[in-house]
């Protein structure tokens, strides 16, 4: 988790002088509770936005937006703590909005936004906005939380972000798989424009089962420059096992930008359709 290295972060708006500060996620009001605390945020919304760094890289960011309740507690509102928690790693990053002037009611509901938390493709987060000061130990909570799911690199907008492109999102191998005679599969795919090796992982399954009955790995050496964007054709020999008929072919590239962690592409061959009634055997065999 990190903040976008963007120009100076601002939270000021007409009628409010405000500054954004790094936070330890442990506001002073936890340790020194105040008697009067503001109410919780209203209508917290989290959306996926995209932002460029100063270097021109494009990253997915969490766009956080919320409004204030229209009660007198805004007179005691000194700021807000924004927290993003990556659910699996338990990594948390916080910033603090520090209000440098008192809030006053005005004709519009107060609205705040922040779009500088960089998020990772295909990851899950919890976003929390805490109004400051935080409540006394038994006081009503004055925060609102929402979970946030970042799409993976297959998502159209995500595909062109720097982290996705680094993992090979622009490569479309256009895999085709055909079943040949004598228990063989012919796999064809388009090579990317990089001299790197590939691995084909074949996993076979019985018709309605998810436990594999055959596995095979095939190494493809790095192509020469003149072979970039060309089709690579590989014939794989299957084990002759009755009913082991559903085949998943996965192609793993080893691009320099992502090494062992590049996006994999796969294609599946289903078991042949079984006719409802067996075909009758003809009484005679035609000679032509």
């Amino acid at each position: 988790l990190r903040l976008l290295d963007h120009r100076a972060l601002v939270c000021s708006q007409p009628g409010l002088n405000c500054t954004v500060k790094n936070s330890t996620c442990l506001d002073d009001s936890w340790i020194h509770p105040r008697n009067l605390t503001p109410s919780s945020p209203k209508d917290l919304q989290i959306q996926l936005h995209f932002a460029h760094t100063q270097q021109g890289d494009l990253f997915p960011v969490a766009h956080i937006e919320w409004t204030l309740q229209t009660d007198a507690s805004i007179l005691y509102l000194e700021g807000a703590e924004l927290s993003v928690l990556q659910l699996n790693t338990n990594e948390r990053l916080c910033v603090r909005f520090e209000f440098l002037s008192k809030l006053r009611h005005h004709h519009r509901r107060w609205r705040f936004t922040f779009s500088h938390f960089v998020v990772d493709p295909d990851q899950e987060y919890e976003v929390t906005v805490h109004h400051l000061p935080k409540p006394i130990p038994d006081g009503d909570p004055n925060h609102q939380s929402k979970n946030f799911l970042v799409p993976d690199c297959e998502h159209a907008r995500m595909k062109v972000t720097t982290p996705c492109m680094s993992s090979g999102s622009l490569w479309d191998p256009n895999i085709t798989v055909e079943t040949l005679e004598a228990h063989q599969l012919r796999v064809s795919f388009t090579l990317w424009n990089e001299s790197t090796h590939y691995q084909i992982l074949l996993t076979s399954f019985p018709h309605m089962e998810n436990h594999s009955c055959f596995e095979h790995m095939h190494h493809i050496p790095a192509p020469r420059p003149e072979e970039f964007h060309q089709r690579s054709n590989v014939t794989l020999t299957l084990r002759n096992l009755k009913g082991c008929c559903r085949h998943q072919v996965q192609i793993q590239p080893f691009f320099s930008s992502c090494l062992n962690d590049c996006l994999r592409h796969s294609a599946t061959v289903s078991c042949p359709e079984m006719p409802d009634t067996p075909e009758p055997i003809p009484d005679y065999m035609p000679l032509w």
Epitope: L87, N88, T89, N90, E124, K146, N147, L149, P151
Partner: antibody, heavy 116, light 107 residues
Framework: QVQLVQSGAEVKKPGASVKVSCKAS????????ISWVRQAPGQGLEWMGW????????NYAKHLLGRVTMTTDTSTSTAYMELRSLRSDDTAVYYC?????????WGQGTLVTVSS | DIQMTQSPSSLSASVGDRVTITCRAS??????LNWYQQKPGKAPKLLIY???NRESGVPSRFSGSGSGTDFTLTISSLQPEDFATYYC?????????FGQGTKVEIK
């Protein structure tokens, strides 16, 4: 091929404990958390909680607090769910599923029957 | 906890029919909703995540829409393998709660 393979069916007496395992393969185990969901016979799905495979952090359904424990063994890419003080209404198929917010891969389920 | 209410609880349809299942949340959940399909004796299968994103490998006849409190799963042309029970699930706030399910039966 991502797979979650669960342990076999169990029959337990009321008051006993059960521990269900869920072995993951086909992906980096510590990249995605594991959630547990159960389904009583003929009923809908009920979220039980989750465990972070990276940090070991857990989040349990309120009504199961004190009775459920979720753990992982990263060396074997296996998640475990233990439920104690079993009651007849704990009879259900218990599923593990990958991730916290969208359950994109599921185990085949483990039937736990609680009967005296 | 956020309550999820599906309707109808069951429906009968024929192959080729357009089928619509709705799910209503007890409070605003943005687009934090998934749809699952479950066949008897099998684990659920993810169809749609974040209200409208089709999971990889799911046929294009399945689509999801909605935001806020009202959501819809549509099967544009019902196939024989689509007869199953469908569940919605919200993940805006924990605990992640499921709808009670909609059983799609053959007419």
């Amino acid at each position: 091929q991502v797979q979650l393979v669960q342990s076999g069916a169990e029959v337990k007496k009321p008051g006993a404990s059960v521990k269900v395992s869920c072995k993951a393969s086909g992906y980096a185990f510590s990249r995605f958390g594991i959630s547990w969901v159960r389904q009583a016979p003929g009923q809908g799905l009920e979220w039980m909680g989750w465990i972070s495979t990276y940090s070991g952090n857990t989040n349990y359904a309120k009504h199961l607090l004190g009775r459920v424990t979720m753990t992982t063994d990263t060396s074997t890419s296996t998640a475990y769910m233990e439920l104690r003080s079993l009651r007849s209404d704990d009879t259900a198929v218990y599923y593990c599923a990958r991730r916290f917010l969208k359950f994109d891969y599921w185990g085949q389920g483990t039937l736990v029957t609680v009967s005296s | 906890d956020i309550q999820m209410t599906q309707s109808p609880s069951s429906l009968s349809a024929s192959v080729g029919d357009r089928v619509t299942i709705t799910c209503r949340a007890s409070q605003d959940i943005d687009s934090s909703l998934n749809w699952y399909q479950q066949k008897p004796g099998k684990a659920p299968k993810l169809l749609i995540y974040a209200a409208s994103n089709r999971e990889s490998g799911v046929p294009s006849r399945f689509s999801g829409s909605g935001s806020g409190t009202d959501f819809t799963l549509t099967i544009s042309s019902l196939q024989p393998e689509d007869f199953a029970t469908y569940y919605c699930q919200q993940w805006a706030n924990m605990p992640g709660t499921f709808g009670q399910g909609t059983k799609v039966e053959i007419k």
